[in-house]
């Protein structure tokens, strides 16, 4: 057993252009906290896989409010170490995941919001009992400086915390055959560790993993009283012939239970009793329970009351991931229909609809002409979510309220004169041209069929609407 310790020295913008000014969003002040996760081995594991060696959360740091001037290179951090206790042997090779979280303290509807600011993942080799290792890592535009070490907790010592020590049995030296435990001069190496579960009262061992029984006891863990003993009559563990070796191979031989689980025989099989944080037939599955508080951002931990049942996090709207650690960009799913603008307000989605559409997702097509009157005899034409008026002659504008001069756009070509008329406009063409807009030249031998001016209108008259 022992403790992994992580000391965060600084967290701040990395060097170079594009460094963020503040860890806080525009919504207001925030504060930082850290999560450390340890996984065994050097394999690349999914970020969601359990922190089998343990995890820890720091306290919240001081509140940070971005000042108008350039921010300090290092942000205010939580005080103290992050400590991750480990129950069994220190593996030596491990994956270290450090997450920097931001807690926003602005006027959040429904309270503070947590979001993952940076995550560094590093595979490392480290012997327990060694000095602090220092590291600098970049995560996006952020830079994290930290130190870490693994140390054993007495009576465990050694680079893997597997050697057990006990106090000296005599003032000047260790007991017979026992060497001092480095680096602790006042402690001595203990006898070998027996098979897991071996009875402390009725069993002993000379080699690690062994379980020899004292007279009158039998079974793989020396817990079964022997009705007839074939053991020698010696009464204590003073020599190799003191007791009985486990009779014959049993289902618990070699201890099939991983991760420090203890094995007990059942009829024709075995059963593993797993330590906290592990479950499965052979304790091979590492598990975090709801008591470890694995759900972030207001997530509710369901199940996982004990290591025999896995937990799941029910995430509040807007978050996802096995620990509710990922903020969902809900607008990326394009929930607003008919060209509506999506707004993620945190507590809910809002769609700002284009004219002519309504509903929570802009799904309702309004009757564009409902309640829309086109003046002066105009008719309403629906289309594309917006209404349009087709105006009667002589009127224009959005609602046909403006008087229109059909001649204003000079529709008559080649010097033709324009006359406003109740049915539209009429062009009086200059000699040599013809057509409704005087667009065609008359053949040299031809004559223009149009009169010089339509009956009832004199050229140059003010526009009249008959």
């Amino acid at each position: 057993a022992g403790v992994f310790e992580l000391q965060i020295h600084s967290f701040g913008p990395g060097p170079g252009p594009g460094a963020p000014r503040s860890p806080c969003s525009a919504r207001g002040p925030c504060r930082l906290f850290f999560r450390v996760c340890l996984k065994p081995g050097l394999s690349e594991e999914a970020a969601e896989s359990p922190c089998a060696l343990g995890a820890a959360l720091s306290a919240r740091g001081p509140v940070y409010t971005e000042q108008p001037e350039a921010p300090a290179p290092d942000l205010p951090l939580p005080n103290g170490l992050l400590q991750v206790p480990f129950r069994d042997a220190w593996p030596g090779t491990f994956s270290l995941i450090i997450e920097t979280w931001r807690e926003e303290l602005g006027d959040q509807i429904g309270g503070p919001a947590w979001s993952l600011l940076a995550r560094v993942t590093r595979r490392r080799r480290l012997a327990a009992g060694g000095p602090w290792a220092r590291d600098i890592q970049r995560a996006g535009a952020w830079e994290l400086r930290f130190s870490y070490r693994a140390r054993c907790e007495l009576p465990a010592v050694g680079t893997a915390c597997t050697r057990l020590c006990r106090p000296r049995s005599a003032p000047s030296r260790c007991g017979p055959g026992l060497r001092p435990c480095a680096p602790l001069e006042d402690e001595c190496e203990a006898p070998p560790v027996c098979r897991a579960g071996c009875s402390l009262e009725h069993g002993f061992c000379e080699q690690p993993g062994e379980c020899r029984c004292l007279e009158g006891w039998t079974g793989p863990l020396c817990m079964v009283p022997a009705s007839t003993s074939s053991c020698l009559g010696l009464r204590g563990p003073s020599s190799a012939t003191t007791g009985c070796l486990v009779p014959g191979p049993g289902p618990c031989d070699g201890n099939p239970c991983a991760n420090g689980g203890s094995c007990s025989e059942t009829p024709g099989s075995f059963e593993c009793t797993c330590p906290r944080g592990f479950y499965g037939l052979r304790c091979e599955v590492s598990g975090v329970t709801c008591a470890d508080g694995p759900c972030f951002n207001g997530g509710l931990c369901v199940g996982g009351a004990d290591p025999d049942s896995a937990y799941i996090c029910h995430c509040p709207p807007g978050f996802q991931g096995s620990n509710c650690e990922k903020r969902v960009d809900r607008c990326s799913l394009q929930p607003c229909r008919n060209g509506g603008l999506c707004l993620d307000l945190g507590h809910a989605l809002r769609c700002r609809c284009r004219a002519g559409f309504a509903g929570p997702r802009c799904e309702h097509n309004l009757d564009d002409c409902a309640g829309r009157a086109c003046a002066n005899g105009g008719t309403c034409v629906e289309g594309g979510g917006a209404h349009r008026c087709s105006c009667a002659l002589g009127f224009g504008g959005r609602d046909c309220r403006e008087r229109a001069d059909p001649c204003a756009a000079r529709p008559c070509a080649h010097g033709g004169r324009c006359y406003a008329h109740f049915s539209g406009l009429v062009c009086a063409c200059a000699p040599g041209y013809m057509g409704s807009r005087c667009e065609f030249p008359v053949h040299p031998d031809g004559v223009s069929a149009l009169p010089a001016a339509p009956p009832g209108l004199r050229p140059g008259d003010p526009q009249r609407y008959l």
Epitope: P112, G298, H314, P316
Partner: antibody, heavy 118, light 108 residues
Framework: QVQLQESGPGLVKPSETLSLTCTVS????????WSWIRQPPGKGLEWIGY???????NYNPSLKSRVTISVDTSKNQFSLKLSSVTAADTAVYYC????????????WGQGTLVTVSS | EIVLTQSPGTLSLSPGESATLSCRAS???????LAWYQQKPGQAPRLLIY???SRATGIPDRFSGSGSGTDFTLTISRLEPEDFAVYYC?????????FGGGTRLEIK
Amino acid sequence: QVQLQESGPGLVKPSETLSLTCTVSGASISSFYWSWIRQPPGKGLEWIGYIYYSGTTNYNPSLKSRVTISVDTSKNQFSLKLSSVTAADTAVYYCARIAVAGFFFDYWGQGTLVTVSS
Amino acid sequence: EIVLTQSPGTLSLSPGESATLSCRASQSVNKNYLAWYQQKPGQAPRLLIYGASSRATGIPDRFSGSGSGTDFTLTISRLEPEDFAVYYCQQYDRSPLTFGGGTRLEIK
């Protein structure tokens, strides 16, 4: 303004199924978790269960074998069914909205008293 | 499940005084996922505090919450006549969601 309104029979016979509906206005049922809570006369509050529009449900283990909560997004409603009722199920039943910041209740219906009696 | 025990069961005070209500959890409540509610006779509960110390919208600042781990407190300073009611705590750290048994705050 978010409002929740419970509806359903106020009297249910023992061994029958209690059915209640909660109609939500002022909030989209697809944007939140929704819950049922009950309160026996003169006693404290007991959480029954919750539902999300996606169909995710979670029930109180003490009631799990008898409870079903369902949701109808088209009507902006969610419902509670509690089977094999006894007199111990007599209570004021509240529907409530679960907040976005966590699984606490930020809006409640006014409650409806359901009496189990023959 | 997490069992929440509220004390005292009944608290008798006068308007203008300060009230301190306690809520103790049988297991540590992670991330301070604890809420407080007020319930008046014939009415539904009303959310006062969430996250152990954050006031809900529209709640006067005479209501404040504190605590962490297993011990939480709701404090009402300068009691007003409308504050006399039953108060419940609720944890939302893990399922099942559980409420305390309530503290009745009555006029002395």
